[in-house]
């Protein structure tokens, strides 16, 4: 049974030409942790593995950093990075789990990080 | 350089046996994901089976679900498909494959012909 | 299972051709598709990954795009060598699944 949930930065936003973190965190579940795969809408930006470490699409390397930790920092941001992003947890034995984030990129200054909020 | 190498293919009778070995070279084995593919005589290509490196899943097509065993010993850095009850349409040439993070399959070795024929 | 259609399942075309074949999903696969060439007695070997990544060592000459249900391999300008079977394959979720192939003759 999947017990565990993720819990993200949830609703962001950050300015255009910043930067921003994206993470997620997997919790109340003992399930070992694999892999995780980062998507924005239908494009996979990135994957760490347990055993492999980091991929970073190619088309994404000059703006896409890994980490901290299982998280991803996107670089030099634009307006058409606004969206939604998803970290998909692979995990052992209990199977995925996704977490979803939205991220505005603002043109101008105010740029206010929404609240955190759990998915199960 | 990466090398995959499968041996163990050859001619069986309907309902008979053989063990398929991949002997890999090159790269760290025990950090990827394998997987087996055939290549039935004229056809295109079928998955078999796959291992995670990390926690050692395995899963199989539903054509050979029960019959075939995919396995690895990361100390001798080799993958291995054992395979039961072998029909007629099990013919076919089986390549093993690296599977970097489980995505895709980057490296195959140069196949193994499997005969089932009476 | 997701089934994935290839068309067209071969074509004729000459050097310095552009070729385009698509590949279609039952169902969304996000980016999770690959493309590999086959010649005739070899294995396989990897073009693109993730829809849109160039493996390591392949021409520039090939591309791929496309996300969730419909994708695309280019050959920007076919060469002598790029006579060959060209294969699609998902891996957004197990059985693996692969298309059923194309076959790219000289006119």
């Known amino acids: 049974m999947m017990t565990g949930t993720i819990e993200t930065t949830g609703n962001i936003s950050a300015e255009k030409g910043g930067s921003i973190i994206l993470q997620c965190h997997l919790s109340s579940t003992t399930a070992q942790v694999t892999q995780v795969n980062w998507e924005q809408q239908d494009q996979l930006l990135a994957i760490c593995n347990a055993d492999l470490g980091w991929h970073i699409s190619p088309s994404f390397k000059d703006r896409v950093a890994p980490g901290p930790g299982l998280g991803l920092t996107l670089q030099s941001l634009t307006v058409n990075d606004t969206g939604e992003y998803f970290c998909i947890y692979h995990t052992y034995p209990d199977g995925t789990y996704t977490g979803r984030i939205f991220l505005e990129v603002l043109e101008s200054s105010v740029a206010e990080h929404g609240a955190r909020f759990q998915i199960p | 350089e990466v090398q995959l190498l499968e041996s163990g293919g050859g001619l069986v009778q309907p309902g008979g046996s053989l063990r398929l070995s991949c002997a890999a070279s090159?790269?760290?084995?025990?950090?990827?994901?394998m997987s087996w593919v055939r290549q039935a005589p004229g056809k295109g290509l079928e998955w078999v089976a796959s291992?995670?490196?990390?926690?050692?899943?395995?899963y199989y097509a539903d054509s050979v679900k029960g019959r075939f065993t995919i396995s690895r010993d990361n100390s001798k850095n080799t993958l291995y498909l054992q395979m039961n009850s072998l029909r007629a349409e099990d013919t076919a040439v089986y390549y093993c494959a690296r599977e970097p993070y489980s995505v895709w399959l980057d490296y195959w070795g140069q196949g193994t012909l499997v005969t089932v024929s009476s | 299972d997701i089934q994935m259609t290839q068309s067209p399942s071969s074509l004729s075309a000459s050097v310095g051709d552009r070729v385009t074949i698509t590949c279609r999903a039952s169902q969304s696969i996000s980016s999770y598709l690959n493309w590999y060439q086959q010649k005739p007695g070899k294995a396989p070997k990897l073009l693109i990954y993730a829809a849109s990544s160039l493996q390591s060592g392949v021409p520039s000459r090939f591309s791929g795009s496309g996300s969730g249900t419909d994708f695309t391999l280019t050959i920007s300008s076919l060469q002598p060598e790029d006579f060959a079977t060209y294969y699609c394959?998902?891996?957004?979720?197990?059985?693996?699944?692969f298309g059923g192939g194309t076959k790219v003759e000289i006119k």
């Open positions: 394959q998902q891996s957004y979720s197990t059985p693996l699944t």
């Open positions: 090159g790269f760290t084995f025990s950090s990827y994901a």
């Open positions: 291992i995670k490196s990390n926690t050692g899943s395995t």
